[in-house]
Interface confidence: low
């Protein structure tokens, strides 16, 4: 399916609006520090060029690859060297090395100011004055902060963003209408970004076999009535889509995602009874809906797996003939029967089954050797079940904030070398698993909890890779994708860690603490908690609780005082002295 001009092909397939949006996202994800106006200029130049190619596919340069065209355009940025340093060296390379070089310089934690939300009236005026610029700015700001955001999904978020302003800027109470919608988009956006980051890490660090295994398990849970051949086709197509998006090929990715949505809607009968309501929606909404669709009902009469995968005398013959297909079948059959298992658990079971066959099919009596393979699954299943049970009990007992604090202490003791902001961010997100998953029925708890934890721990791995400080973190992050969470769970107090020297400055607070939002206050207190544990890693829960209670009382007292700053200046050193004594 070759085209004389790739850029013309994608422009025609996607249409001008989506083409421009995707090019803006691509450029913003590569050059994260460039000003908005610079990116808009580059996008307009690329769009004008694409239109000349649509008019005449034989025109000069229209036959060039998208990487060549986009890379050439990025390399025209005058301030590349001073803004990005060694990333400018990418421009000396030829494709495909140049694009690989740009990808390697994507920054998961760019030094960008947090987005401040203006007053509602200010936002509505900006929306009405220039809707197109307003929406482009949204794409730009999100894309540069989230360089692996799933681009076609970001277009869907932008469409929802636009709809929120169109509706709420005409409402009687604009703020009451708009702010909850913006909060929802922000939270969903962060979650979407983190989920996509795990997909890209899976592809880039562990290869497409790892991603395909994940996709077989997840799609088999979602579509348990679909045939293996159907699931395999969807997995192949989905892998192509995500490989493209993670590789910066956003136009191809969006185009292929649209094709996949079309295929699924044309073949609903052989995939799932749940697709119907998605397929009536417009493209962006349809693709989102298909990605989030609930699991179909399991067929009622599925026979036992043991017959084909344990009792059959042909297991080793079948395994030897087509290892990946046979294991794929096993994973498909197991996953469709277990929507109550996390995908990561299903992948561990497939890995255990593979290891048993590798060992047993070389044994004198293979059948005797693998006869008890399903019994070996029991401890693998019980471990996440117990973990979810214990942590949900703790969450219900403590509430979200204190549950986060318990995790902060737990993870700081495990990996105290990790930076305090990273420990706070990751532990706060780990703590959100409670509100997200513990209220669900038993059968949905494990898939919700463990697969969410995998996403959060991937964030830790991604941040740690940028600035490696802990061998334990490196080990858990790189040895096995499916065993990351059990690896972190198994970490104990780091006995080799030399406690951090006490720094009074870290525990000095000012009156500005009183004007912070509740969330910002929590982050301040949790930052102090991490620093306390780094100073006294062997402090007991009771000691830490005492210090934190004193801290809360001290802040509350000073925020009620007439002269707040004077109170902080006087009471702060007392709090520090009392804390040191309590932890001695």
């Amino acid at each position: 399916d070759t085209h004389k001009s790739e850029v013309a092909h994608r422009f025609k397939d996607l249409g001008e609006e989506h083409f421009k949006g995707l090019v803006l996202v691509a450029f913003s994800q590569y050059l994260q520090q460039c000003p908005f106006e610079e990116h808009v200029k580059l996008v307009n130049e690329v769009t004008e060029f694409a239109k000349t190619c649509v008019a005449d596919e034989s025109a000069e340069n229209c036959d060039k690859s998208l990487h060549t065209l986009f890379g050439d355009k990025l390399c025209t940025v005058a301030t590349l060297r001073e803004t990005y340093g060694e990333m400018a060296d990418c421009c000396a390379k030829q494709e495909p090395e140049r694009n690989e070089c740009f990808l390697q310089h994507k920054d998961d934690n760019p030094n960008l100011p947090p987005l401040v939300r203006p007053e509602v009236d200010v936002m509505c005026t900006a929306f009405h004055d220039n809707e197109a610029t307003f929406l482009k700015k949204y794409l730009y700001e999100v894309a540069r902060r989230h360089p692996y955001f799933y681009a076609p999904e970001l277009l869907f978020f932008a469409a929802r963003y636009k709809a929120a302003f169109a509706e709420c800027c005409q409402a009687a109470d604009k703020a009451a209408c708009l702010l909850p919608k913006l909060d929802e988009l922000r939270d969903e956006g962060k979650a979407s970004s983190a989920k996509q980051r795990l997909k890209c890490a899976s592809l880039q660090k562990f290869g497409d076999r790892a991603f395909k295994a994940w996709a077989v398990a997840r799609l088999s849970q979602k579509f348990p009535k679909a045939e293996f051949a159907e699931v395999s086709k969807l997995v192949t197509d989905l892998t192509k889509v995500h490989t493209e998006c993670c590789h910066g090929d956003l136009l191809e990715c969006a185009d292929d995602r649209a094709d996949l949505a079309k295929y699924m809607c044309e073949n609903q009968d052989s995939i799932s009874s749940k697709l119907k309501e998605c397929c009536d929606k417009p493209l962006l909404e349809k693709s989102h809906c298909l990605a989030e669709v609930e699991n179909d009902e399991m067929p009622a009469d599925l026979p036992s797996l043991a017959a084909d995968y344990v009792e059959s005398k042909d297991v080793c013959k079948n395994y030897a003939e087509a290892k990946d297909v046979f294991l794929g079948m096993f994973l498909y059959e197991y996953a469709r029967r277990h929507p109550d298992y996390s995908v990561m658990l299903l992948l561990r079971l497939a890995k255990a089954y593979e290891a048993t066959l590798e060992k047993c099919c070389a044994a004198a009596d293979p059948h005797e050797c693998y006869a008890k393979v399903f019994d070996e699954f029991q401890p693998l299943v019980e471990e996440p079940q117990n973990l979810v049970k214990q942590n949900c009990e703790l969450f219900e007992q403590l509430g979200e904030y204190k549950f986060q604090n318990a995790l902060l202490v737990r993870y700081t003791k495990k990996v105290p070398q990790v930076s305090t902001p990273t420990l706070v961010e990751v532990s706060r997100n780990l703590g959100k698993v409670g509100a997200k998953c513990c209220k669900l029925p038993e059968a949905k708890r494990m898939p919700c909890a463990e697969d969410y934890l995998s996403v959060v721990l991937n964030r830790l791995c991604v941040l740690h890779e940028k600035t490696p400080v802990s061998e334990k973190v490196t080990k858990c992050c790189t040895e096995s994708l499916v065993n990351r969470r059990p690896c972190f769970s198994a970490l104990e107090l780091d006995e080799a860690y030399v406690p951090k020297a006490f720094n009074a400055e870290t525990f000095t607070f000012h009156a500005d603490m009183c004007t912070l939002s509740e969330k910002e206050k929590q982050v301040k207190k949790q930052t102090a908690l991490v620093e306390l544990v780094k100073h006294k890693p062997k402090a007991t829960k009771e000691q830490l609780k005492g210090v934190m209670d004193n801290f809360a009382a001290f802040v509350e007292k000073c925020c009620k005082a007439d002269d707040k700053e004077a109170c902080f200046a006087e009471e702060g050193p007392k709090f520090v002295a009392a804390s040191q004594a309590a932890l001695a």
């Epitope: 009535k225 045939e227 293996f228 084909d308 005398k313 042909d314 013959k317 046979f326 059959e333």
Partner: nanobody, 115 residues
Framework: EVQLVESGGGLVQAGGSLRLSCAAS????????MSWVRQVPGKGPEWVSA????????RYAESIKGRFIISRDNAKKTLYLQMNSLKPEDTAVYYC????????GSQGTQVTVSS
């Protein structure tokens, strides 16, 4: 591309017999268990019978036990269903699937049993 093509269906009197065939291509037929599934219009698919990859282990739904026999010829990449003592309630579209799926991945073959 995986393809499964069923044949052998038709109209038969109650008590009569039919032999269905399913020709497979596009995958290693001998490496997979196979199933027969049937569907009556307006109803969900019903699993009928399964056979392991080597043809040694066979399983049947209660409703057809003792009347139907599943078999396979791996050299010919073909799955069979010998249907004896047919009853009007066996009327359905029959199709074969890889593994133990009850999803319709092919066109199927119509079996009609008249009383």
């Amino acid at each position: 591309e995986v393809q499964l093509v069923e044949s052998g269906g038709g109209l038969v009197q109650a008590g009569g017999s039919l032999r269905l065939s399913c020709a497979a291509s596009g995958f290693t037929f001998g490496s997979f268990g196979m199933s027969w599934v049937r569907q009556v219009p307006g109803k969900g698919p019903e699993w009928v019978s399964a056979i392991d990859s080597g043809g040694t282990d066979t399983r049947y739904a209660e409703s057809i036990k003792g009347r139907f026999i599943i078999s396979r010829d791996n050299a010919k990449k073909t799955l069979y269903l010998q249907m004896n003592s047919l009853k009007p309630e066996d009327t359905a579209v029959y199709y074969c699937t890889i593994g133990q799926s009850t999803s319709r991945g092919s066109q199927g073959t119509q079996v009609t049993v008249s009383s």
